[in-house]
Amino acid sequence: LSEEADDTDSELGSMKPLHTFCAMKADDGPCKAMIRSYFFNMYTHQCEEFIYGGCEGNENRFDTLEECKKTCIPGYEKTAVKAASGAERPDFCFLEEDPGLCRGYMKRYLYNNQTKQCERFVYGGCLGNRNNFETLDECKKICENPVHSPSPVNEVQMSDYVTDGNTVTDRSTVNNIVVPQSPKVPRRRDYRGRPWCLQPADSGLCKASERRFYYNSATGKCHRFNYTGCGGNNNNFTTRRRCLRSCKTGLIKNKSKGVVK
């Protein structure tokens, strides 16, 4: 059996954060957008993801993981430089691939100690271990020695696809669920709201059936759809009210003439 090293404690456990706001709890604020953000968690001494509502909140909120780490983790830039120069890699870079307990299909990257390179793997969506990066860049920065790494290959952006075994499947028909596509989408210049409100409903990658709402920019209304429990996009709200509050405000009336091809 593949037994994982205990990677639940951060190496920086005893250190104090660099700024007082790094000690604040994650605050999603009163608004109901779903913006992926990062905060420094005082308990785990790591930067972690949370969903920001789009307004108010506090200073312990960052657009990128990197920004959060630089701001709140003492000595992070030094250790990142060390790792990049090949002098020292964090222990978690040597952990074996762990897809985790759950079975969503999420594209992630891990450092492979055999090949000495960062590689793509499919993460199940929960638990697993810290050898698990959202981007190839982040994996390379932290775990790979750039001296030995080949020049970056132009990678196809896979964010709109999921890998299922060796095949690449268009997400609009994952799990035999045909995602409702908006018949008409207003020109982007006619919609001044949040960009994800223009995205089609995406039922996601798992097998649950959860009632959610998405904003249909053609009708200016929020419609119900079945969400499978993981994956998908940000045009995904737990109530119609939240959906309308988040997306309706951006529509400029009487301007929806064209269709985006």
Partner: antibody, heavy 123, light 112 residues
């Protein structure tokens, strides 16, 4: 319907090894849409997760730090069951022990539990 | 470890009346797209626990619609819209954001 049937002794002497087995029907121990866990319950500790095993092209296990040096959870694919071994037990390990299935596809939770086995550690 | 704290620890209820149980986690349990890494279980007297609510707000198979889960971040609530006699037992919340998986200390619901 998934059923988990526990077996093993209810009385173990201090410093000995606690051994329990959980027989699975209605699912496979090597299913890639499940994980198999042991959880115990005592008045002092409440529900305490001990460890889990799961198969995703190969076997994985994770254990609670509190018992990590003493615990082993193993699958037995030929009998479609999994077992718990807890070494060097003390009276503190007295509890009701449950095996449980973690549903990896839909629920993402412990959706099936064994009947529970009260294990008393006493000389 | 993520600490799960439930309140109240004991909840006397009247059949037909609503009931509410709170669960607070020591760190955020919300993942992207609104997935909440939190489950609720009910352990009826003399029985093993059973899954009630998964991913924060979704009822498990066979669970009556009088049960609902809500909350985000670190604060979660289990509500019973109209308590029935068969709902007595101990209710537990459980997180699976990180290892070790941890449970709340339980809320005992009993009929007044």
């Amino acid at each position: 319907e998934v059923q988990l049937q526990q077996s093993g002794p209810g009385l173990v002497k201090p410093s000995q090894t606690l051994s329990l087995t959980c027989a699975i029907s209605g699912d496979s121990v090597s299913s890639d849409s499940a994980a198999w866990s042991w959880i115990r319950q005592s008045p002092s500790r409440g529900l305490e997760w001990l460890g889990i095993i799961y198969y995703r092209s190969k076997w994985y296990n994770r254990y609670a730090v509190s018992v990590k040096s003493r615990i082993t959870i193993n699958p037995d694919t030929s009998k479609n069951q999994f077992s718990l071994q807890l070494n060097s037990v003390t009276p503190e390990d007295t509890a009701v022990y449950y095996c449980a299935r973690w549903h990896s596809d839909k629920h993402w939770g412990f959706d099936d539990w064994g009947q529970g086995t009260l294990v008393t550690v006493s000389s | 470890d993520i600490v799960m704290t439930q309140s109240p620890l004991s909840l006397p209820v009247t059949p037909g009346e609503p009931a509410s149980i709170s669960c607070r986690s020591s760190q955020s349990l919300v993942f992207r797209f609104g997935i909440t890494y939190l489950n609720w279980y009910l352990q009826k007297p003399g029985q093993s626990p059973q899954l009630l609510i998964y991913k924060g707000s979704n009822r498990a198979s066979g669970v009556p619609d009088r049960f609902s889960g809500s909350g985000s971040g670190t604060d979660f609530t289990l509500k019973i819209s109209r308590v029935e006699a068969e709902d007595v037992g101990v209710y537990y919340c459980q997180q699976y954001t990180s290892y070790p998986l941890t449970f709340g200390q339980g809320t005992k619901v009993e009929i007044k």
